[in-house]
């Protein structure tokens, strides 16, 4: 009803038409720079009522020093110079990550007002005469089902039960215990271990992509950019989680294998078949030896049954195989397998899911590998609570079923997950995690231990800050007598003094007024929020504390609710935005109902196709009908009737 929809998951986007030739030239200059970390790439554009002044530099943190790309029987030291990370100049706490290919930026930009995603326009719109080359949309405009179906996106309980039993059958290989571990002074050894494990916080990944993933994204660069953005997204989530005292867990890509369309006919490519079920697909990944990696994933573009978006082996502290650092071993079916594996797909119910969806899917599946089963119990599934105060924050990352993705908890781990993951990390991370990198002076971002950061000598135009080529003890420090550096924020002049009180440092947005310098810091102070309940996002939402976050219901003192099928409610209403009086679910009714006529004037606001509906029992189709999901559908029953499990196993192989 509102906005400019891009596809069935994205309800509003804007086009970008900045000069691609200019950005391509800047990228080439950055690529030729003497040091591979010494040149900023700048990109300026206006969208969504605000200015984006991106300053990015090559991202070397995501790929290990011995990073390799394998493709069609060739192993290459691949050039990752098109992968960039950075921030919005002058916006503290902002972050951007993506790639520049043929002069176009693709990736995500985190701002105070939420995350924006930038993608090539032709991925969604086939019209060649478009006046723009890229699309940009806000995370709030993604109607994100996250998990569809009975267990939403991550296979149902019976699949995990089968997998759990199989994990118990691994045969440990006898290995020589290192001599030092026989030492008598046990406590000393434990103390030593604990101090070294403090730095071992990086999980190295092997990512493979199948020919269908390549077919969708089109080039090696685009595929690597996708991998990079997925890894960066989970890196952000895990780094900011405290796993019972274990902090700063990060991820790094050690190796990539890209199966191109040429590999579709290659008999040695296990992922070449078009119609592989999700369990079989994971098994094919697991049949390879992944001992050199913390985790090994395959990315695909397949539409698995029941809306499954991913699958992974669940880690355990002991007594069972699977998850992080697991080595290849023999199992009950006589096969050697690596269970430090998982898979994700970027397609669901015939539509490509937005990057945010697959980023969180990836975080969810890696959560399994790290030892978290699906959340259960009242403490860890607040979205199912009868207590509306708890319910409104939604469910956590490891929730098994449909999730809207816009609630406070959707991007966090529950206490249940944290308890499980911390036990597995305690036991297993010493087996394969590596030490991570430190803050980098010269990357243009003021990090811990730095006073300022204006980059390397050939790019530092700052009279206020010692550049990164200066000796230790001086580099990234303010020059004597200088008050500040522009690298610290937009409220510092080129003359190294704080800007005066009245100067503007940030444009206003839907929900926040312009930022004004305060005269005593280089940072742009937080903008004053516009009044709560100001309409935003084309009237579909309202501003709450400066963020376009609340439901339109809140504007009228109501709460959003799920129109569930009961007391003669018409099925079509299951796909309407519904509101209720606070703490009174009996008043839940469509925005287009008689009851809420005073507020919405008969205007029905509908959910986007693919949104969870009927209290997470199904999802809305393109005709705004709530399709209930039958976990044990007719096809599954037919299979069971025709084949015995053993016979079906053989056929599947």
């Amino acid at each position: 009803q509102y906005g400019n929809p891009l596809n069935k998951y994205i309800r509003h986007y804007e086009g970008l038409s900045y000069n691609v030739d200019s950005l391509h030239q800047k990228h080439q200059r950055a690529k030729r720079a003497v040091s591979h970390e010494d040149q900023f790439l700048r990109l300026d554009f206006h969208a969504h009522g605000r200015h984006f002044n991106l300053r990015m530099k090559r991202d070397t943190s995501l790929f290990s020093d011995e990073f390799k790309v394998e493709t069609s029987n060739k192993v290459l030291d691949y050039d990752t110079s098109h992968i960039y990370t950075g921030h919005i100049y002058g916006e503290e706490g902002s972050f951007s990550h993506g790639s520049v290919i043929d002069g176009r930026f693709e990736g995500f930009i985190q701002t105070r007002g939420g995350t924006f995603y930038v993608e090539p326009a032709e991925r969604y719109i086939k019209d060649r005469t478009l006046p723009f080359h890229s699309v940009i949309y806000h995370e709030d405009d993604i109607n994100y089902p996250h998990k569809y179906g009975p267990q939403g996106g991550c296979a149902d309980h019976s699949v995990f039960e089968r997998m759990r039993k199989y994990q118990m059958t691994g045969v440990e290989e006898v290995t020589q215990i290192p001599q030092e571990e026989h030492a008598a002074n046990g406590p000393e050894l434990l103390r030593k271990k604990r101090t070294t494990s403090a730095e071992k916080n990086t999980c190295q990944l092997y990512i493979q992509t199948d020919h269908l993933f390549f077919k969708y994204y089109g080039t090696r660069e685009a595929v690597i950019a996708q991998i990079s953005s997925h890894v960066k997204a989970i890196d952000t989530i895990y780094q900011t989680t405290d796993f019972s005292g274990i902090r700063n867990i990060s991820f790094m890509v050690k190796r990539i294998r890209i199966n191109t369309t040429a590999d579709e006919k290659d008999p040695t490519n296990p992922f070449r078949f078009p119609n592989i079920g999700v369990e079989k697909f994971l098994e094919l990944n697991s049949e390879q030896n992944h001992d050199d990696y913390c985790l090994a994933y395959v990315f695909t573009d397949r539409d698995f049954d029941d809306g499954v978006l991913g699958l992974a082996w669940v880690g355990a502290p002991s007594g069972s195989s699977g998850g992080i650092c697991e080595k290849s071993k023999l199992y009950s079916d006589g096969k050697k397998k690596s269970l430090n594996t998982g898979i994700i797909t970027v397609q669901n119910y015939g539509s490509h899911v937005p990057p945010k969806v697959s980023h969180i899917t990836f975080a969810h599946e890696v959560g399994h590998n790290f030892g978290s089963p699906h959340d259960s119990g009242t403490e860890c599934t607040p979205g199912e609570s009868k207590n509306l105060g708890q319910k409104e924050n939604g469910n956590y990352i490891m929730y098994a079923r449909a999730t809207s993705g816009d609630k406070l908890n959707n991007n966090k781990f529950s206490l249940c997950s944290i308890r499980n993951i911390s036990q597995v990390l305690e036991k297993k991370r010493n087996n394969c995690f590596v030490e991570s990198g430190q803050p980098i002076c010269g990357n243009g971002m003021v990090e811990q231990g730095e006073e300022c950061d204006c980059g390397y000598s050939d790019q530092c135009k700052d009279e206020c800050c010692f550049d990164a080529n200066q000796p230790e003890g001086r580099k990234c420090k303010l020059k004597p007598g200088k008050q500040c550096s522009p690298s610290q924020g937009p409220c510092c002049t080129a003359q190294c003094a704080f800007k005066s009180k009245s100067e503007k440092c940030r444009d206003d947005s839907d929900c926040a007024r312009e930022g004004i310098c305060n005269g005593f810091t280089a940072l742009c102070p937080a903008s004053d929020p516009k009044p709560n309940f100001t309409d935003c996002n084309r009237h579909t939402q309202v501003c709450i504390n400066g963020q376009c976050a609340g439901s339109i219901c809140e504007k009228y003192g109501l709460e959003e609710c799920t129109c569930a099928s009961s007391d003669g409610k018409d099925d079509k209403e299951l796909c309407h935005v519904c509101c209720m009086k606070k703490m009174d679910p009996s008043t839940c009714a469509s925005t287009g109902s008689v009851q809420w006529s005073r507020h919405f004037s008969g205007r029905t606001i509908t959910l986007q196709p693919g949104s969870p509906c009927n209290d997470f029992r199904g999802y809305c189709d393109v005709f705004m009908r709530c399709r209930l999901v039958d976990a044990d559908g007719p096809l599954a029953r037919l299979k069971k009737a025709i084949f015995s499990p053993e016979l079906y196993e053989n056929i599947a192989e």
């Epitope: 003669g568 409610k569 018409d570 209403e573 309407h576 839940c588 009714a589 469509s590 287009g592 109902s593 008689v594 009851q595 006529s597 008969g602 029905t604």
Partner: nanobody, 120 residues
Framework: EVQLVESGGGLVQAGGSLRLSCAAS????????MGWFRQAPGKEREFVAF????????DYADSVKGRFAISRDNVKNTLYLQMSSLKPDDTAVYYC?????????????WGQGTQVTVSS
């Protein structure tokens, strides 16, 4: 398919009165909620009043309370809006609509509208 036809609109002086009618094509109308909405040029549609199937329950927008009265004649299949003490702000296209039997039903059928202009 329910057809709704509004009539009774026109030009009136501020402080004057008008009576709008909405004729429904089918008899099912007698048990259903009915309502009036209006839309002024350049503005969003705005709720005016609704009435339940038996006429026992009504509600009005604050801006028209005490000046407008909604009623229905289930024998004639007609909905009415008696408007008095009209103001220039009441200038708009007035639409009638039909919902289901319950207060939670949605407004599913709409008329084409009748223009009301109040001059000062």
């Amino acid at each position: 398919e329910v057809q709704l036809v509004e009539s009774g609109g026109g030009l009136v002086q501020a402080g004057g009165s008008l009576r709008l009618s909405c004729a429904a094509s089918e008899r099912i109308f007698s048990t259903y909620f009915m309502g009036w909405f209006r839309q002024a040029p350049g503005k969003e549609r705005e709720f005016v009043a609704f009435i339940s199937g038996n006429g026992g329950s009504t509600d009005y927008a604050d801006s028209v309370k005490g000046r407008f009265a909604i009623s229905r004649d289930n024998v004639k299949n007609t909905l009415y809006l008696q408007m008095s003490s009209l103001k220039p702000d009441d200038t708009a296209v007035y639409y009638c609509a039909v919902a289901g039997r319950q207060i939670k039903s949605t407004w599913d059928y709409w008329g084409q509208g009748t223009q009301v202009t109040v001059s000062s």
